[in-house]
């Protein structure tokens, strides 16, 4: 549906509040270093312009594309060259190349200060003094640190953020009310950002077909009663939404997401019986709820898959007629029967099936050739099952912190060239799979664990892509999206790695560690553990465990000492010497 003015169209569809919020997110995700005030100024200028177009769609420049309008606006920033260096060269390009150029310069790990949470009273005063600015600042700070955050979902987070302050700043104990809510929003926000980053990586690095395959599998698990044609329609629409958001087209994305939610709710009966509650909610909550909705019950008496996909004499004929449709149907049928499988496993099975048909449909006796294709699935299914069983066993034995440490050692040995902060961050997140998924019964463990691991390993991939240091990481990240986790799992110790020189400063600790939060203290100890493995990659787990136990005792002892700093200095030297002897450093 062509509109004379795209900007007027989106302003009317979304309303002024959402329009302004989405433009702010878009600008902050592109120009991540710009001050808040500069972005607000740009957003206000764009909004005023949009209003003139609403009043008269034929007014000057109103017929320009959003990319042209937004790009022109971003290119007016005076300090572009000083602040962003070569990104300023984007402004010499024409659309669509200019937008592609901006997208390529999005930074997954921007050099920004950590967000420090002020005192509750300070936050409440700021909230009451200027609610609008306070909430805009939230959008800005999240968007610039998470340049692929799913914009319409960020509006939902902002709504909850506002609700938390509205409620808690009036409470008797403001802190007790507010802090747990903010912690929850922070943790959920990080998870949401990482999940969306995988969707964007899937689209940008592996293409639309890869994303659509993922969507077919996931939606078929979620809506097993829906017909294939219905699932296909939802997949097409969902792909459009995420392509837009990942491409920086946030107004179109939010608009299309609202349309998709509307469609799903109008067609609940042919989609899922679990949507009723979601569809009674306001728009932002509704969209979020649909995205998180539990899997519907599988239809009773689904026939065996073998009839249509192995035993039928028309398999090759059906495949040849429309390859992707036939593979899509296979994936749909397999996924709706297997909510107990991870999406990535389902995609591996579909790939195996596709490879077999490619080979067998060209053979003398195709049926004889593909008759045993389902037997090839067994080892593919058992591999993640075994891995999850083993790691949950270790998690239950160790608890989260020590389980993270085991993963830190494991991944540092596999890819020791990766920076220590990245190894710590990724391994800590990998370790959270234990608390998140091991509590589930068998039928829910694999989809929980393996699909979560895909999200975390994508973090490693995008961080590594910015500064590539390991051919093994590059290989696992780029060869196959669905085989990333098995690729990393299969890595043994990197025999080519030259151990890092010993540096006493790396293992020198001070009394300030005693005042850190438990989480920060863990990160300090885990940083030391990674450095230890980088110095001594051949150290056994028993050796490392002994050193870490001694280290924990040392920190505990010195934090209880009267003269903490002296204790850290003297006992620290002894600990380093003992560790060197134990590990033969």
């Amino acid at each position: 549906d062509a509109h004379k003015s795209e900007v007027a169209h989106r302003f009317k569809d979304l309303g002024e509040e959402n329009f302004k919020a989405l433009v702010l997110i878009a600008f902050a995700q592109y120009l991540q270093q710009c001050p808040f005030e500069d972005h607000v100024k740009l957003v206000n200028e764009v909004t005023e312009f949009a209003k003139t177009c609403v009043a008269d769609e034929s007014a000057e420049n109103c017929d320009k594309s959003l990319h042209t309008l937004f790009g022109d606006k971003l290119c007016t920033v005076a300090t572009l060259r000083e602040t962003y260096g070569e990104m300023a060269d984007c402004c010499a390009k024409q659309e669509p190349e200019r937008n592609e150029c901006f997208l390529q310069h999005k930074d997954d790990n921007p050099n920004l200060p950590r967000l420090v949470r002020p005192e509750v009273d300070v936050m409440c005063t700021a909230f009451h003094d200027n609610e609008e600015t306070f909430l805009k600042k939230y959008l800005y700070e999240i968007a610039r640190r998470h340049p692929y955050f799913y914009a319409p979902e960020l509006l939902f987070f902002a709504k909850r953020y506002k609700a938390a302050f509205t409620e808690c700043c009036q409470a008797a104990d403001k802190a007790a009310c507010l802090l747990p809510k903010l912690d929850e929003l922070r943790d959920e926000g990080k998870a949401s950002s990482a999940k969306q980053r995988l969707k964007c990586a899937s689209l940008q690095k592996f293409g639309e077909r890869a994303f659509k395959a993922w969507a077919v599998a996931r939606l078929s698990q979620r809506f097993p009663k829906a017909e294939f044609a219905e699932v296909s329609k939802l997949v097409t629409d969902l792909t459009k939404v995420h392509t837009e958001c990942c491409h920086g087209d946030l107004l179109e994305c939010a608009d299309d997401r609202a349309d998709l939610a509307k469609y799903i709710c109008e067609n609940q009966d042919s989609i899922s019986s679990k949507l009723k509650e979601c569809c009674e909610k306001p728009l932002l909550e509704k969209s979020h709820c649909i995205a998180e909705v539990e899997n519907d019950e599988m239809p009773a008496d689904l026939p065996s898959l073998a009839a249509d996909f192995v035993e039928s004499k028309d398999v090759c004929k059906n495949y040849a007629e429309a390859k992707d449709v036939f593979l899509g149907m296979f994936l749909y049928e397999y996924a709706r029967r297997h909510p107990d499988y991870s999406v990535v496993l389902l995609l591996r099975l579909a790939k195996t099936y596709e490879t077999t048909l490619e080979k067998c449909c060209a053979a003398a006796d195709p049926h004889e050739c593909y008759a045993k294709v389902f037997d090839e699935f067994k080892p593919l299914v058992e591999e993640p099952q075994n891995l999850i069983k083993q790691n949950c066993e270790l998690f239950e034995q160790l608890g989260e912190y020590k389980f993270q440490n085991a993963l830190l050692v494991r991944y540092t040995k596999k890819v020791p060239q990766v920076s220590t902060p990245t190894l710590v961050e990724v391994s800590r997140n990998l370790g959270k799979v234990g608390s998140k998924c091991c509590k589930h019964p068998e039928a829910k463990r694999m989809p929980c664990a393996e699909d979560y691991l895909s999200v975390v390993l994508n973090q490693l991939c995008v961080l590594h892509e910015k500064t590539p240091v390991s051919d093994r990481v590059t290989k696992c990240c780029t060869e196959s999206l669905v085989n990333r986790r098995p690729c990393f799992s299969a890595l043994e110790v990197d025999e080519t790695y030259v151990p890092k020189e010993f540096n006493a400063e790396t293992f020198t600790f001070h009394a300030d560690i005693c005042t850190l939060s438990e989480k920060e203290r863990q990160i300090k100890k885990q940083t030391a553990l990674v450095e230890l493995v980088k110095h001594k990659p051949k150290a056994t787990k028993e050796q490392l465990k002994a050193v870490m136990d001694d280290f924990a005792a040392f920190v505990e002892k010195c934090c209880k000492a009267d003269d903490k700093e002296t204790c850290f200095a003297e006992e620290g030297k002894k600990l380093v010497a003992a560790s060197q002897a134990a590990l033969g450093l």
């Epitope: 075994n386 891995l387 069983k389 083993q390 066993e393 270790l394 034995q397 085991a406 494991r410 040995k413 799992s489 299969a490 890595l491 043994e492 110790v493 056994t540 787990k541 028993e542 465990k545």
Partner: nanobody, 124 residues
């Protein structure tokens, strides 16, 4: 420390059987998982089978599933690998290894202690 010594290797015809043993001494063997790895001539070391510390979970490489059986006898501080329907591609040096987590991982670097290996040759 745990010391591991493998035995039972030798020359066998295709289709034949062998039983490898792994004798452990030193620390309490029952707290460790046990694994068998092999290194075929001119190739990397590869996982064959493992058994966790309690003996209730066993894992096998796809290439040996249904032909090899891993077991342990903690009273004797022994581990075993029963190999049947042997093929020429099973020819390798077989190593026994102990894992302090007690899990029985697939990756060799997860194992703290290793034996020196025993040669298995399958040939007619």
């Amino acid at each position: 420390q745990v010391q591991l010594v493998e035995s039972g290797g030798g020359l066998v015809q295709p289709g034949g059987s062998l039983r490898l043993s792994c004798a452990a001494s030193g620390r309490i063997f029952s707290t460790y998982a046990m694994g068998w790895f092999r290194q075929p001539p001119g190739k990397e070391r590869e996982f064959v089978a493992s058994i966790n510390r309690s003996g209730d979970s066993t894992y096998y490489a796809d290439s040996v599933k249904g032909r090899f059986t891993i077991s342990r006898d903690d009273a004797k501080n022994m581990g075993y690998l029963q190999m049947s329907s042997l093929k020429p591609e099973d020819t390798a040096v077989y190593y026994c290894a102990a894992d302090s987590d007690g899990i029985g991982w697939f990756n060799s670097f997860e194992y703290d202690y290793w034996g020196r290996g025993t040669q298995v040759t399958v040939s007619s």
